[in-house]
């Protein structure tokens, strides 16, 4: 028997504020059984960004269907993406347990925001085909 | 408050059908994964189907598979059990059951009574 | 025939502790769950996860898992606990939902 591991195929993933962040993780087998929980960060300082079993997260929403008995898409998206989400996002698989027991994590997925961009728009004078290609950066 | 309410059941006969629904309320139907679980006469419980919260997955044992079809309205709250070629040995009360995130499940109907007779 | 082994019959004096035992599923990769039926009743889940116990229901009512058995474990059992008692599971590597055949718990007196 296969041991089980968890993929995060992207390295880093890059978004731009106010927009969405998919980030795509798969588990090579349902076997043990335990809840796929997401993280960001490391150590006991981890911060839980998702728990499949519990737990609200209004921002956070699975990609794949969760009911589905061979579901193995532990992918996640995560809504109106702000400067302060930055940071390495993991995937980790527990084995059931009192209380579950972390078996592996993914190698993990650096999320970096870009600032919203946003256009000047002028009516007047000869510089406007130059002025419309400004980027004015928000934080 | 979480609450599920079978109805359908009834006398057929051997080799007829009969569809029994499961209306649900006071959660978010569809978002939970359903299943129906039978009890014969004076018998212990038997699962009989499972579906997935968006409906496209189905999951049966094989006493019943090629017989019976699970299927759910998530736009009107509902679960459905279409049981084709009846047998004696599907007299049973029916429960609709919610499914936890793990399959088990934490919600039953008070269950509907179908008997297979001539 | 049940995938899923229990006691057929239990028997306990009020006040004392009753447990039910479970066996025959694969450990790593089954969920079980604990139901509770009385006559002319539906099921009321007890446990689910092996060992979670819905807000609803007494503490009294205990999960336990130790290898391929689980253990329900009622302490200080009352007359209304006298019921039906369902193990059932989640079968990872089947996609199904075993059940035990059930056991009847008498309490005494």
């Known amino acids: 028997e296969e041991e089980l591991q968890v993929i995060q195929p992207e390295k880093s993933v890059s978004v731009a504020a106010g927009e969405s962040a998919t980030l795509n993780c798969t588990a090579t087998s349902l076997i043990p059984v335990g809840p796929i929980q997401w993280f960001r960060g490391v150590g006991p300082g981890r911060e839980l960004i998702y728990h499949q079993k519990e737990g609200h997260f209004p921002r956070v929403t699975p990609v794949s269907d969760p009911t589905k008995r061979n579901n193995m898409d532990f992918s996640i998206r995560i809504s109106n993406i702000t400067p302060a989400d930055a940071g390495t996002y993991y995937c980790v698989k527990f084995r059931k347990g009192s209380p579950d027991v972390e078996l592996k994590s993914g190698a993990g997925t650096e999320l970096s925001v870009r600032a919203k961009p946003s256009h000047h728009h002028h009516h007047h004078g000869l510089n406007d085909i130059f002025e419309a290609q400004k980027i004015e950066w928000h934080e | 408050e979480v609450q599920l309410v079978e109805s359908g059941g009834g006398v057929v006969q051997p080799g007829g059908s009969l569809r029994l629904s499961c209306a649900a309320s006071?959660?978010?139907?569809?978002?939970?994964?359903m299943s129906w679980v039978r009890q014969a006469p004076g018998k212990g419980l038997e699962w009989v189907a499972g579906i997935s919260a968006g409906g496209s997955d189905t999951y049966y044992p094989a006493s019943v598979k090629g017989r019976f079809t699970i299927s759910r309205d998530n736009s009107k709250n509902t679960l459905y059990l279409q049981m084709n070629s009846l047998r004696a040995e599907d007299t049973a009360v029916y429960y609709c059951a919610r499914e936890t995130w793990n399959h088990l499940f934490d919600y039953w109907g008070q269950g509907t009574l179908v008997t297979v007779s001539s | 025939s049940y995938e899923l082994t229990q006691p057929p019959s239990v028997s306990v004096s009020p006040g004392q502790t009753a447990r039910i035992t479970c066996s025959g599923g694969?450990?790593?990769?089954?969920?079980y769950a604990w139901y509770q039926q009385k006559p002319g009743q539906a099921p009321v889940t007890l446990i689910y996860s092996d060992d979670k116990r819905p807000s609803n229901i007494p503490e009294r009512f205990s999960g336990s898992s130790s290898g391929t058995t689980v253990t329900l474990t009622i302490s200080g059992v009352q007359a209304e606990d006298e019921a039906d008692y369902y193990c059932?599971?989640?079968?990872?590597?089947?996609?199904?939902?075993?059940f035990g055949g059930g056991t009847k718990l008498t309490v005494l007196g």
């Open positions: 006071g959660f978010t139907f569809s978002s939970n994964a």
């Open positions: 694969s450990y790593s990769s089954y969920y």
């Open positions: 059932g599971g989640y079968d990872q590597s089947s996609y199904t939902n075993p």
